[in-house]
Interface confidence: low
């Protein structure tokens, strides 16, 4: 048994038939000595009585708000949940595997530049009597500081029957230092409860394994004089790391007709510029990677030909 | 080429053979986000690499203030990976393919560290690995770390030179 | 839990080598170098080296001048320390310690004596 | 090599009272990652040094809050605020921010 926060505990159990269960000894916080009896969540059934109680606790049943009250007068609580263990295996059940880019990724992280900021998100299909908290740091042996606050539900999707609800957080690190070679991992911890359930997820990369920069912006097509050519422009993202003469992204230009059948051209350049055939019904797209570090391409920024 | 008593290096040279060393080293192992290496062992597993730290002045106000110290940390790291790749790690069992980039971001990695360091002058390098793994899986396994590490490295050494040539140069 | 677990005592004539062991477990030997630490009689401590398991690198301390080669097996888990020459003024207890210094061996006490 | 002066040699001390020791070095322990390299440890009777503090000053693991470190580059304190009977041993500093590590001579807390 360990504390989660103030009055909240988590009893480690291993999951299988006819297992002991954990033996649980409840003190109550109170200088009182006698009179003191025990219940549990709503009910009013006396548990036992006496400063402490002990319980085995074996199964959801014997988790939940567990009172001392003296003379009618409740004298403080504790809040026992359940962290299963099936065969060896902490249980994974609150959040939906998505399967990107592995099996049992749970927990999805991104950065959009070396700033020390990154966002993550997971998925459940659980909509109520369910909370999230999310610790972070640089490192886990000697951990350096970064700064998570509070999970949000940021999507809510129909899936088949089901509903889907994505919550996400950002991050922080305290003390980022962007132009650096990192060489210990950012780790990010999300506790989550369900009811009477505690399951913790984790989550290590580097910062420059997560990027994915903002597609570029103010993509523009200028023709060129008697020809089918067009010169193509944007910008660097305003969310990239500056500056761009050291943190330099590589292009990837792609020329699409109406069908998806119909074959790409594709021209990659280090320029914020360049020149393409137009061919009528079809579209531009550009899209930006770290030109030194093959992290994610970000989505497309599109504008058609005409 | 950079000269004892901390003139300048040739930062357009350097740029474009630090980008070359960024595409070697990923067509070297381009599989880095399907293998999660760091399930192989926390987080001190390059643990001895050298790497380019924050206050290694190789961001761009450290490199307008005095690039030396960024170079130092730079050569030292080219020539602990120009080690590594000419060990027995990479040249053991299993053998490399015949046409495998790894013998060229070898060469590129001393050629690189050269131009940073004509002969005579003595920049501090760090011990470098004596570790022969007696597994094949053991090497296999150490060579996958040692280029994602190093692609970590070249990455920063190529923003450091693009930054330079963009900047710094006469 | 992390246990460093050294080798016993040993008594050694001056000019001979002795080779202290360090089996560790409770953590993923490769993942944290190893120091050696020696402590003479009422003496203070002294950092002898320190090795990364992974890939076997080695930093000495120059004092030793070749006189000090640390090693691991990591099949084994263990590390080793390998003290040459040996001299009366190396009698001390000698230490492993892991990255950190947050987790010591016992100690094993060399005893240097003709 | 960096040279770690470490004072007192002896401190007695009486139960409940506080306590300090001083580690001065001959080069500046902060990095330029903001952090100062220097370690502080209990060395018990017959024992294994233990870490009580790294980084100058985070407490290691099941450390008492009693014992705080503190001070600059160059010149750093271990305080115990309340001395205990268990405390008493031989306490050492320890300078990582480069090779060779060293440590401070060690000073010896005995209750009065």
């Known amino acids: 048994i360990w504390e989660l926060k103030k009055d909240v505990y988590v009893v480690e159990l291993d999951w299988y038939p006819d297992a002991p269960g954990e033996m649980v000894v409840l003190t109550c916080d109170t200088p009182e000595e006698d009179g003191i009896t025990w219940t549990l969540d709503q009910s009013s059934e006396v548990l036992g009585s006496g400063k402490t109680l002990t319980i085995q606790v074996k199964e959801f049943g014997d988790a939940g708000q567990y009172t001392c009250h003296k003379g009618g007068e409740v004298l403080s609580h504790s809040l026992l949940l359940l962290h299963k263990k099936e065969d060896g295996i902490w249980s994974t059940d609150i959040l939906k595997d998505q399967k990107e880019p592995k099996n049992k990724t749970f927990l999805r992280c991104e950065a959009k530049n070396y700033s020390g900021r990154f966002t993550c998100w997971w998925l459940t299909t659980i909509s109520t009597d369910l909370t999230f908290s999310v610790k972070s740091s640089r490192g886990s042996s000697d951990p350096q500081g970064v700064t998570c606050g509070a999970a949000t539900l940021s999507a809510e999707r129909v899936r088949g029957d089901n509903k889907e609800y994505e919550y996400s957080v950002e991050c922080q690190e305290d003390s980022a230092c962007p132009a650096a070679e990192e060489s210990l991992p950012i780790e990010v911890m999300v506790d989550a409860v369900h009811k009477l359930k505690y399951e913790n997820y984790t989550s290590s990369f580097f910062i420059r394994d997560i990027i994915k920069p903002d597609p570029p912006k103010n993509l523009q097509l200028k023709p060129l004089k008697n020809s089918r050519q067009v010169e193509v422009s944007w910008e660097y993202p305003d969310t990239w790391s500056t500056p761009h003469s050291y943190f330099s992204l590589t292009f990837c230009v792609q020329v699409q007709g109406k069908s998806k059948r119909e074959k790409k051209d594709r021209v990659f350049t280090d320029k914020t510029s360049a020149t393409v055939i137009c061919r009528k019904n079809a579209s531009i797209s550009v899209r930006a990677q770290d030109r030194y570090y093959s992290s994610s391409w970000s989505e497309w920024a599109s504008v058609p030909c005409s | 080429r950079a000269v004892p008593g901390g003139s300048s290096p040739a930062w357009t040279q350097c740029q474009q053979l630090s980008q070359k060393l960024c595409t070697l080293a990923w067509s070297a192992h381009p599989l880095v986000g399907h293998m999660d290496l760091r399930e192989e062992g926390d987080e001190e597993t390059t643990n001895d690499v050298p790497h380019i730290q924050c206050g290694d002045g190789c961001d761009p106000q450290g490199l307008r203030d005095n690039s030396q110290f960024c170079l130092q940390r730079i050569h030292q790291g080219l020539i602990f990976y120009e080690k590594l790749l000419g060990s027995d790690i990479f040249t053991g069992e299993p053998s490399l393919l015949p046409d495998s980039p790894v013998g060229q971001l070898h060469a590129s990695l001393l050629g690189l560290s050269q131009l940073l360091q004509p002969e005579g002058h003595h920049w501090e390098t760090q011990q470098i690995p004596s570790l022969s793994p007696s597994q094949p899986w053991q090497r296999l396994l150490l060579r996958f770390k040692i280029l994602r590490s190093l692609q970590a490295f070249v990455a920063v050494a190529a923003r450091v030179f693009a930054h330079g040539a963009a900047t710094l140069s006469p | 839990e992390f246990q460093l677990v050294q080798s016993g005592a040993e008594v050694k004539k001056p000019g001979a080598s002795v080779k202290v062991s360090c089996k560790a477990s409770?953590?993923?030997?490769?993942?944290?170098?190893m120091n050696w630490v020696r402590q003479a009689p009422g003496q203070r401590l002294e950092w002898m080296g320190v090795?990364?398991?992974?890939?076997?690198?080695?930093t000495y301390n120059q004092k030793f001048k070749g006189r000090v080669t640390i090693t691991v097996d990591t099949s084994a888990s263990t590390a080793y320390m390998e003290l040459s020459s040996l001299r009366s003024e190396d009698t001390a207890v000698y230490y492993c310690?892991?990255?950190?210094?947050?987790?010591w061996g016992q100690g094993t006490l060399v005893t240097v004596s003709s | 090599d960096i040279v770690i002066t470490q004072t007192p040699l002896s401190l007695p001390v009486t139960p409940g009272e506080p306590a300090s020791i001083s580690c001065r070095s001959s080069k500046s322990l902060l990095y330029k990652d903001g952090k100062t390299y220097l370690n502080w440890f209990l060395q018990r009777p017959g024992q294994s040094p233990q870490l009580l503090i790294y980084l100058m000053s985070t407490r290691a693991s099941g450390v008492p809050d009693r014992f705080s470190g503190s001070g600059s580059g160059t010149d750093l304190t271990l305080k115990i605020s309340r001395v205990e009977a268990e405390d008493v041993g031989v306490y050492y500093c320890q300078q990582i921010a480069e090779y060779p590590f060293t440590f401070g001579s060690g000073t010896k807390l005995e209750i009065k």
């Open positions: 310690a892991r990255r950190g210094f947050a987790y």
């Open positions: 409770g953590y993923t030997f490769t993942d944290h170098n």
């Open positions: 090795i990364n398991p992974n890939y076997g690198t080695t």
